[in-house]
Interface confidence: low
């Protein structure tokens, strides 16, 4: 049986709806793939990604991935379907309106990932849940 929040359309594509049955439109996310970053030891950083993309599928959410190794720091911003793993991790926080970074175990690097489901929510990545977004001391991402 088809769950109540997913309806089949005539042409066999999925029409994604929310729990109230309203059609869920694709959301907007920052989508710059990977950029070198200077975001380090901060409570929060802005992506400084100039590309806002309409996600390809209505169920996709915004994702940000922060990686640090011996050579550099990168910040990745994409759309992704939360039903599918990303970087081999499940997007556990996909319903969150804010992108709260959580550390994941990856050998050889420091790896944080967050996902969220409000428009352009991966523009502001938060490493501390108590962080006050009015703090002016944000370190911006530098484009490669």
């Amino acid at each position: 049986t088809i769950p109540p929040h997913v309806q089949k359309s005539v042409n066999n594509d999925m029409i994604v709806t929310d729990n109230n049955g309203a059609v869920k439109f694709p959301q907007l996310c920052k989508f710059c793939d990977v950029r070198f970053s200077t975001c380090d030891n901060q409570k929060s950083c802005m992506s400084n990604c100039s590309i806002t993309s309409i996600c390809e599928k209505p169920q996709e959410v915004c994702v940000a991935v922060w990686r640090k190794n011996d050579e550099n720091i990168t910040l990745e911003t994409v759309c992704h379907d939360p039903k599918l793993p990303y970087h081999d991790f499940i997007l556990e926080d996909a319903a969150s309106p804010k992108c709260i970074m959580k550390e994941k175990k990856k050998p050889g690097e420091t790896f944080f990932m967050c996902s969220c489901s409000s428009d352009e929510c991966n523009d502001n990545i938060i490493f501390s849940e108590e962080y006050n977004t009015s703090n002016p001391d944000l370190l911006l991402v530098i484009f490669q």
């Epitope: 793939d33 990977v34 590309i51 190794n69 081999d88 990856k106």
Partner: antibody, heavy 121, light 107 residues
């Protein structure tokens, strides 16, 4: 169905130029990084160049820097490789491929069928 | 640049054999390792990405493992269509680099 079709290869003299094209269909071209990978006759694979989804960032392997230039036209769903000052060692089959952003999906997939570039006098 | 070294460079095997190909990186690449299959005159085909994730449509007899510097591609039961050359590729840092290839031939 995803398709990548390369064209523009051929025989060229050392020091000459060629422009390769890769026509893409079946996915949202503007949303993905694209790359060129080459394979000399009887040899292995060598990454040549990559370009970001928007076209604002490019990377080239050291051996082609200053000679090759990757570009894209998102309105035409086409990837290009402008090759100048060609050398004998540039002789190879050149493949275009979807991908390579430095992410967990940092792989080349799918690939075009390739176009042969022969540099010889 | 990160060097990728595959072994063996070639091997002979029979249909039904279990085949293992190894790939070693010159420095730690975490799990940023991909495997491709290439048949003569054809484009490479992605088999495994992120060291162990099977690409959609690839038969489950292919598997990948490893992390850091040492990685393995295993074909659990070799099929006639599996005779080809296999390449590993690191995607940890630019430039992305490939192994020299392992040719799997019919014994």
């Amino acid at each position: 169905q995803v398709q990548l079709v390369e064209s523009g290869g051929g025989l060229v003299q050392p020091g000459g130029s060629l422009r390769l094209s890769c026509a893409v269909s079946g996915f949202q071209f503007r949303r993905y990084a694209m790359s060129w990978v080459r394979q000399a006759p009887g040899k292995g694979l060598e990454w040549v160049s990559s370009i970001s989804a928007s076209g604002d960032r490019t990377h080239n392997t050291d051996s082609v820097k200053g000679r090759f230039s990757i570009s894209r036209d998102n309105s035409k769903n086409t990837l290009y490789l402008q090759m100048n000052s060609l050398r004998a060692e540039d002789t190879a089959v050149y493949f275009c491929a979807k991908g390579l952003a430095a992410s967990g999906k940092n792989y080349f997939d799918p690939w075009g069928q390739g176009t042969l570039v022969t540099v010889s006098s | 640049d990160i060097q990728m070294t595959q072994s063996p460079s070639s091997l002979s095997a029979s249909v039904g054999d279990r085949v293992t190909i190894t790939c070693r990186a010159s420095q730690s690449i975490s799990s940023y390792l991909n495997w491709y299959q290439q048949k003569p005159g054809k484009a490479p085909k992605l088999l495994i990405y992120a060291a162990s994730s099977l690409q959609s449509g690839v038969p489950s007899r292919f598997s990948g493992s490893g992390s850091g510097t040492d990685f393995t591609l295993t074909i659990s039961s070799l099929q006639p269509e599996d005779f080809a050359t296999y390449y590993c590729q690191q995607s940890y840092s630019t430039p992305p680099t490939f192994g020299q290839g392992t040719k799997v031939e019919i014994k």
